[in-house]
């Protein structure tokens, strides 16, 4: 990882300090949270297995407007090796299940400390 | 209020199998981790696994091969069993609750523990 | 796995000192260590976690600092209630595993 999705950095970003950033990210909206996050916004749920980070930012890139999750957004394009636009699926979509944006902060949250606790960052 | 509370053997033979049950109050098993902790007599703490919020486990990988973790949320209950049981694995046996809602993890409500003696 | 190192293993100490211990880690944890206190006979109590937030009900004479590899556990003025051992804890990586304890006993 050069770069995590737009975040100045003198060099490359160790995986494991990439992905410690994203999990603390994510605690921090969870910790957050007052009113419904994202206005209560419905995004598709993804299969957590490989590729989910691309497939993860698919999802939350479908929410417009919501401040809480844009640094989410450019932490996971930093994980992602393709450019990812709204609109755009892949097939880690479980695509007849919607899910509240916070629960699948803290749905990717879990599965992402239990990847960081096994030392797995790529 | 959270409360956590172990209950099993006191005393296994070695080579037996020990089976542990963590009763919990006060919080859902499906939005807190559980965690397993023993402590031999005057030593220190060893971590032994956990039960996480989905249902899911992870193991210290030392003990890996002799331990399960399951669960009955109906029940509030998290199991611990330990095979092929060992002198040196008498200790004092400790769940926890997780604190969650952090990115480490760390135990903040421990139940009262039991000792549990491995002798023939 | 990451080792943890207290020192001293054990100091006397008279109510009303500053108490200060410390905790050594084998790698890098960041910031995610824990301090727990526990008396005989009875479980651990957590103190602190991610290396100074303090536990609710906690005594504000407990604090935590550091970062990286090094952390420090300190008791701003001893109380009789304090004698016990301590430990410390890293939350980083999977084993999770604790310092060797630290036993604070009355001079």
């Known amino acids: 990882l050069t770069c995590l999705g737009g975040f100045a950095s003198p060099g490359p970003v160790p995986p494991s300090t990439a992905l410690r950033e994203l999990i603390e990210e994510l605690v921090n909206i969870t910790q957050n949270q007052k009113a419904p996050l994202c206005n209560g916004s419905m995004v598709w749920s993804i299969n957590l297995t490989a590729g989910m980070y691309c497939a993860a930012l698919e999802s939350l890139i479908n929410v417009s407007g919501c401040s809480a999750i844009e640094k989410t957004q450019r932490m996971l394009s930093g994980f992602c090796p393709h450019k990812v636009s709204a609109g755009q699926f892949s097939s880690l979509h479980v695509r007849d299940t919607k899910i509240e944006v916070a629960q699948f902060v803290k749905d990717l949250l879990l599965h992402l400390k239990k990847l960081f606790r096994e030392g797995q960052f790529n | 209020q959270v409360t956590l509370k172990e209950s099993g053997p006191v005393l296994v033979k070695p080579t037996e199998t020990l089976t542990l049950t963590c009763t919990v109050s006060g919080f859902s098993l499906t939005n807190y981790h559980v965690q397993w902790i023993r402590q031999p007599p005057g030593k220190a703490l060893e971590w032994l696994g956990v039960m996480w919020s989905d249902g899911d486990t992870s193991f210290n990988s030392v003990l890996k091969s002799r331990l399960t973790i399951s669960r009955d949320t109906s029940k509030s209950q998290v199991v611990l069993t330990m095979t092929n049981m060992d002198p040196v694995d008498t200790a004092t046996y400790y769940c926890a609750r997780d604190g969650t809602i952090a990115a480490m993890d760390y135990f903040d409500y421990w139940g009262q523990g039991t000792l549990v003696t491995v002798s023939s | 796995d990451i080792q943890m190192t207290q020192s001293p293993s054990s100091l006397s100490a008279s109510v009303g000192d500053r108490v200060t211990i410390t905790c050594l880690a084998s790698e890098d944890i960041s910031n995610y260590l824990a301090w727990y206190q526990q008396k005989p006979g009875k479980a651990p109590k957590l103190l602190i976690y991610h290396t100074s937030r303090l536990q609710d009900g906690v005594p504000s004479r407990f604090s935590g600092s550091g970062s990286g590899t090094d952390f420090t556990l300190t008791i701003s003025s001893l109380q009789p209630e304090d004698f016990a051992t301590y430990y410390c804890?890293?939350?980083?990586?999977?084993?999770?595993?604790f310092g060797g304890g630290t036993k604070v006993e009355i001079k």
């Open positions: 804890q890293q939350g980083y990586r999977f084993p999770l595993t």
